[in-house]
Each structure stands twice: as structure tokens, then as C-alpha cells.
């Protein structure tokens, strides 16, 4: 099933236009912005979601120390170029012919250059560290309960297999979720960790991408887990290439 047949909507992506014009009158959904057909039985790629977002109206200690090569998405929103599979193209350029290379989650991994800049391949982000700070609670959450609930959330809401949730670290009030997925581990049909992390990030911000599904209601043994800040670090299979100028 690519979409809910009865009312022809896309359960996994509200930023779509759906109509019963598929084969045999089946419901078919296309992403806003790109017009690309999307599979509504799984998460839509982050590239297509960002493109749709840009086209939409604007009103719309056990802890891990991120490695020196970890990237944070400081550039924010941009209108990306996506390939026919919906993945980010390795090279992204803006309207003023400023170009840069991105990784598989669309985060810049080189200095900005001009149209002569070459990005030979799309470098895979194989390790994502989601750093959360939760609001004060009566007491600390039980670590194993928290671990189990977060794995269940990623499995049931984002369809990410628990084997890709490498670890859940907790030192009140900081929670860190490590997602790991090498190219060799990702089988056909597996949700990409970058897409799962993006859906999670939007859920945490109260901007759910799901159609007609309630917002994120995360509870650990009945106690609500409310997040007050999120930081996401991205680690690529090949370290990023920035000049020393950026690092000073």
C-alpha cells in the first residue's frame, strides 16, 4: 500500500498532494515542491521533505563526546536538489551560484565555493548522535525503561529496526540516542537513520510530519518525557573537508 485508500492521504507525510490517479485508480501521493511520487508506507526522504518545506507557505559522562569530525546543521533550511530516488545530490548550490558538498543527511561538509566545486560522491552519514535535555521531573527516569521506550518509539513510529539504535545514554537531564547504520548494514526497505532522526527532530519540535496521527506523546512508565532542547551531531564515513580558517 502506498497510501491510505479510503480518503487518499499519505499517513507518513502530510506535505503531499494525493489523488486516485495511480494504476487501477489507486491512491498516489506526490511530495510538494518536487512533485515526486512517494511511498506512503515508509518515511519520506529528508531531501524531499526539506524541498516540500521550502515550497510551503512560510507560516507553516557515560555521555558521548562528539568526535572532532561531528557535524552540526548550522546552515539551517535551504532548498535542496534531490536525485531521482529522493536522496540529496552531493553538490548543492544556491541561486547566487555558491556551491558546497553535503552528506547523506544534507548537512554541509565542505567550505562553500563556486560552480567549479566538485563533489565526487554522496558521503554517507553512518553515525548520528541525538542529544536531548528533558524538563525537570520528580526523579530521574530508570535507564533501562528509558532505553526500551526510545527503541520502541524508533521501531514503531519511525519503522527503524532496533539494531540501528546502537545505544541510549542517560545522565539526568541529558539523554543521548546513538543511531548507527553503515552502507553494508542497510538492506533494501530499511529506513535510513538520517530520515528517522529528521522525523524525530520534527516530532520533538511539535512539527509532526505524520498525517492524522497524534503528536509525539513519549512516556516512560507513565511519566511524560518532555524535551526542552535538542542537538544533533552527524558523523560521516569519510571525515568532512573544511579549511583551517573555519576551525579558528
Amino acid at each position: 500500500h502506498t497510501a491510505a485508500q479510503d480518503n487518499c492521504t499519505c499517513p507518513t507525510n502530510k506535505m503531499t498532494v494525493c489523488s486516485p490517479d495511480g494504476p487501477g485508480g489507486r491512491c498516489q501521493c506526490r511530495a510538494l515542491g518536487s512533485g515526486m511520487a512517494v511511498d506512503c508506507s515508509t518515511l519520506t526522504s529528508k531531501c524531499l521533505l526539506l524541498k516540500a518545506r521550502m515550497s510551503a507557505p512560510k507560516n507553516a559522562r557515560t555521555l558521548v563526546r562528539p568526535s572532532e569530525h561531528a557535524l552540526v546543521d548550522n546552515d539551517g533550511l535551504y532548498d535542496p536538489d534531490c536525485d531521482p530516488e529522493g536522496r540529496f545530490k552531493a553538490r548543492q548550490c544556491n541561486q547566487t551560484s555558491v556551491c558546497w558538498c553535503v552528506n547523506s543527511v544534507g548537512v554541509r561538509r565542505t567550505d562553500k565555493g563556486d560552480l567549479s566545486l566538485r563533489c565526487d560522491e554522496l558521503v554517507r552519514t553512518h553515525h548520528i548522535l541525538i542529544d536531548l535535555r528533558h524538563r525537570p521531573t520528580a526523579g530521574a527516569f530508570n535507564h533501562s525503561d528509558l532505553d526500551a521506550e526510545l527503541r520502541r518509539l524508533f521501531r514503531e513510529r519511525y519503522r527503524l529496526h532496533p539494531k540501528f539504535v546502537a545505544a541510549v545514554h542517560y545522565e539526568q537531564p541529558t539523554i543521548q540516542i546513538e543511531l548507527r547504520q553503515n552502507t553494508s548494514q542497510k538492506a533494501a526497505g530499511d529506513v535510513d537513520i538520517g530520515d528517522a532522526a529528521y522525523y524525530f527532530e520534527r516530532d520533538i519540535k511539535g512539527e509532526s510530519l505524520f498525517q492524522g496521527r497524534g503528536g509525539l506523546d513519549l512516556r516512560v512508565r507513565g511519566e511524560p518525557l518532555q524535551v526542552e532542547r535538542t542537538l544533533i551531531y552527524y558523523l560521516d564515513e569519510i571525515p568532512p573537508k573544511f579549511s583551517m580558517k573555519r576551525l579558528t
Partner: antibody
Framework: QEQLKESGGGLVQPGGSLKLSCKAS????????VSWVRQAPGKGLEWIAY????????YYATWVNGRFTISSHNAQNTLYLQLNSLTAADTATYFC?????????????WGPGTLVTVSS | DVVMTQTPASVEVAVGGTVTIKCQAS??????LAWYQQKPGQPPKQLIY???TLASGVSSRFSGSGYGAEFTLTISGVECADAATYYC????????????FGGGSEVVVK
């Protein structure tokens, strides 16, 4: 050949305890989740608990209320279910069932079951 | 809590006939539904997963359909060996769940 085999069932008095085992063979325990499901004589299937052994994540049916505990010994490819404060209503065949290794919870491999009888 | 309701509880069918069993979920479960066959003294055997995908080694006389909250198991060209109890199971969530299985449907072959 992939197999599950339960053991540890038998006759137990009301209020007593029992520990059931489920031995897995022919596959790597760590790549799957496993459930305990029970069936009272002449009744339907009732899910009890689920464990993802690789991370020791455990989940229980709402009615369990701490009476039962699921656990695993990964090196021995063995799953356990500790049954406490047993009553006659717990008389059933107890099955262990493995998920298919996908993101949903469908069970494609079942053991033959072990019978637990609670009676004085 | 997702509750699964199965109908009918029992159905009689002649050899060669067709039987339909329905399963209703109390909430939308997309296509996360499995069907099992159980014969007396045996463990359940998976027939269908993802609402309509036939499990390995299962006869194509069995078919599943549905999406969201309404699902159907159809057995066509019924054989004596199909006499069993059939269970549906929501395979979406194990959080705050009483029982993911439906109550069962007994198929009696005449």
C-alpha cells in the same frame, strides 16, 4: 534448522512459582525479538511479554502487573519466563515465539509449547 | 490499547468452498497485521504477514487483504486440512497492549 523448544512446565500449587525456559537453535538470538504467548485449555492466544535480547529491552502485556519476568541468556541462546504468585487462571500451554527480524512484531517461528498446571 | 475483534467465532464450510474471516482493529494499524493457523495440540503457524504477504511455504489458497483497521483472511478451494482455528494479530505495537491477538475463528470443514 531454526527451532525453539520450551521446557520447565509442570504441576505447581496456587501461590507457587515456576521458571520456564526456551532454547533457540539454528539462528543468532541477538538478531531477533522473542515473545512468550500462552493458551488456556480451549481458549485463544494471549500475549505475555517480549524481549529484544541484544539490548535486554523488555515489554509486558498490561495485565501482567509484575507477576511475570522475561529474561534471556544470550550466550546460551535461551529465553526465560519467571512465573510468580500463580493461580488456577494461569493454567495454560506456554509458547515462545520469535519475530521475523523485521520492524513489525509478526511471529514466524514457534516452539511446541510447555504445559503449566496450577492446582492443589 | 489496540483491541482486535475477530468474526465469526465459528464457521462451517464445504470442501471446495470459500471462507472469509474478518478482523477489526480498534485503531489504525496500517498494514501491520498477521494471520495464524492453529490445529489442536500444535503451536500456531504463520500464514500471512503485512496484511497480505504470504508466509514462506503457505498455499496460495490463503490470501489476506485490508488496511488501516479492517482486514480479511480468505481461504479458497477449502480442503479438509484447513480445519483449524485462525487468529489475527496486530503487529504494530507492544506498548500499552492487553493482547495483540484476536479471539480466534474456528473453521469447520464439512
Amino acid at each position: 534448522q531454526e527451532q525453539l523448544k520450551e521446557s520447565g512446565g509442570g504441576l505447581v500449587q496456587p501461590g507457587g512459582s515456576l521458571k520456564l525456559s526456551c532454547k533457540a537453535s539454528g539462528f543468532d538470538f541477538n538478531n531477533y525479538g522473542v515473545s512468550w504467548v500462552r493458551q488456556a485449555p480451549g481458549k485463544g492466544l494471549e500475549w505475555i511479554a517480549y524481549i529484544y535480547p541484544a539490548f535486554h529491552n523488555t515489554y509486558y502485556a498490561t495485565w501482567v502487573n509484575g507477576r511475570f519476568t522475561i529474561s534471556s541468556h544470550n550466550a546460551q541462546n535461551t529465553l526465560y519466563l519467571q512465573l510468580n504468585s500463580l493461580t488456577a487462571a494461569d493454567t495454560a500451554t506456554y509458547f515462545c515465539a520469535r519475530d521475523a527480524g523485521s520492524v513489525d512484531y509478526n511471529f514466524n517461528l514457534w516452539g511446541p509449547g510447555t504445559l503449566v498446571t496450577v492446582s492443589s | 490499547d489496540v483491541v482486535m475483534t475477530q468474526t465469526p467465532a465459528s464457521v462451517e464450510v464445504a470442501v471446495g468452498g470459500t471462507v472469509t474471516i474478518k478482523c477489526q482493529a480498534s485503531k489504525n494499524i496500517d498494514s501491520n497485521l498477521a494471520w495464524y493457523q492453529q490445529k489442536p495440540g500444535q503451536p500456531p503457524k504463520q500464514l500471512i504477514y503485512a496484511a497480505s504477504t504470504l508466509a514462506s511455504g503457505v498455499s496460495s489458497r490463503f490470501s489476506g487483504s485490508g488496511y488501516g483497521a479492517e482486514f480479511t483472511l480468505t481461504i479458497s478451494g477449502v480442503e479438509c486440512a484447513d480445519a483449524a482455528t485462525y487468529y489475527c494479530q496486530q503487529a504494530l505495537t507492544i506498548g500499552n497492549v492487553d493482547n495483540p491477538f484476536g479471539g480466534g475463528s474456528e473453521v469447520v470443514v464439512k
